[in-house]
């Protein structure tokens, strides 16, 4: 089986997580991703995803949350403004891909957030001014309200063959600003 | 602190093959995706290859993709670079990186590094 | 892959002096440009990320700036301890790739 470890990734309170999720760029580039949490004992919630298909460099904001798919770059962007101490969990990239089940994009990221500045000018401590660069233009996705009982399959890194490795179960459910609208038939 | 060794370096002919380790102290080895980073004498930096927290997720550099293995051993807080066929052009002072807390692609803390010479 | 291009490959300057860096990028690369600074015999250290963002306990001459395909490291007086080589780094897609490198030595 393959082994869920966890990317941890630690900031502050007011910083922006700005993570990258890697695919392969012919199969994955016009698919629908999404950024999911995972909490204990409960099947992995969809925050937010980008458009179907998925538009190259097109920014889509939920909340607090920023989607930006880079198909000529193979990869995801993912930014969490704002963060708040409550953010803290596990988190995820996926891409909707039916009827198959979603791959999982790179590993399970684990975020820490804790409380206050470090008092230096980190990496990261002015980029919560990230969100006002994003254009007016920025779309709100719908997210597919996908129900398969199946498994998560992990992408394969772009240099090795395509394998699909079950991981857990999944369930993608949707925030509650985000209009629930059944996308696969 | 954070604290990357390196080891495993020395000469070795055109063709043969090394074995490097890193090994890890003072953060969660596993929870970090890690790197290797060469430098050939008198030359600009070069990344070699990445592999991600689980070993799920591995990356390289054109010039050394299916001569070149990175693997890790969360376990032992190792990471390693089985290096075969090796060139004259491979020469060069090898880094264990990894990236800091918040980003990946960076690379922020180094290992002092290890000289790897392939000649004749 | 990204070639990034680094120049001049060497700067000559005197302590007090202003110096810029410039790195240009074969393709858009958004922000996603690191700047580091290594003296001989020594591992790289990591300076700036996100073009623009000064890691912690780097001192406040060294900037960065731009985005896209076009970057500046500007050190706004050169200190004794500056002279070394700086390279720039895009870790957008893979491969990450590095530019040249630009050697600060003493006029």
């Known amino acids: 089986a393959t082994k869920l470890t966890e990317e941890k990734y630690e900031l502050k309170e007011g910083q922006t997580l700005d993570v990258k999720c890697d695919y392969t760029l012919e199969k994955f580039a016009s698919s629908q991703k999404a950024w999911q949490i995972i909490r204990d004992g409960e099947m992995p919630k969809t925050l937010a995803c980008t458009e179907r298909p998925s538009k190259n460099s097109h920014p889509v904001q939920v909340g607090r949350i920023i989607l930006e798919d880079y198909h000529d770059h193979g990869l995801l962007r993912v930014r969490m403004v704002n963060l708040q101490v409550e953010d803290s969990g596990l988190y995820q990239c996926v891409i909707y891909q039916p009827p198959k089940e979603p791959h999982m994009l790179f590993d399970r990221i684990r975020l820490v957030v804790t409380k206050g500045f470090s008092g230096t000018p980190g990496s990261n401590e002015n980029s919560t001014q990230n969100v006002y660069k994003i254009p007016p233009t920025t779309t709100k996705a719908l997210c597919p309200l996908y129900t398969s009982p199946r498994t998560v399959t992990q992408a394969p890194p772009k240099s090795t063959a395509d394998v699909s490795t079950p991981d857990s179960e999944i369930n993608l459910t949707n925030v509650t600003d985000i209009i629930r609208v059944p996308v696969f038939n | 602190e954070v604290q990357l060794v390196e080891s495993g370096g020395g000469l070795v002919k055109p063709g043969g093959s090394l074995r490097l380790s890193c090994a890890a102290s003072?953060?969660?080895?596993?929870?970090?995706?890690m790197n290797w980073v060469r430098q050939a004498p008198g030359k600009g930096l070069e990344w070699v290859s990445s592999?991600?927290?689980?070993?799920?997720?591995?990356y390289y550099a054109d010039s050394v993709k299916g001569r070149f293995t990175i693997s890790r051993d969360n376990a032992k807080n190792s990471l390693y670079l089985q290096m075969n066929s090796l060139k004259a052009e491979d020469t060069a002072v090898y880094y264990c990186?990894?990236?800091?807390?918040?980003?990946?692609?960076?690379?922020?803390?180094w290992g002092q590094g290890t000289l790897v010479t392939v000649s004749s | 892959d990204i070639q990034m291009t680094q120049s001049p490959s060497t700067l000559s300057a005197s302590v007090g002096d202003r110096v810029t860096i410039t790195c240009r990028a074969s393709?858009?690369?958004?922000?996603?440009l690191a700047w580091y600074q290594q003296k001989p015999g020594k591992a790289p250290k990591l300076l700036i990320s996100?073009?623009?963002s000064l890691e912690s306990g780097v001192p406040s001459r060294f900037s960065g700036s731009g985005s896209g395909t076009e970057f500046t490291l500007t050190i706004s007086s050169l200190q004794p301890d500056d002279f070394a080589t700086y390279y720039c780094?895009?870790?957008?897609?893979?491969?990450?790739?590095f530019g040249g490198g630009t050697k600060v030595e003493i006029k």
């Open positions: 990186a990894r990236r800091p807390d918040d980003r990946r692609g960076l690379f922020q803390h």
């Open positions: 003072g953060f969660t080895f596993s929870s970090y995706s």
């Open positions: 592999i991600s927290s689980s070993s799920n997720y591995i």
């Open positions: 393709q858009s690369i958004n922000s996603w």
């Open positions: 780094q895009q870790y957008g897609p893979y491969p990450y790739t």
């Open positions: 996100d073009a623009s």
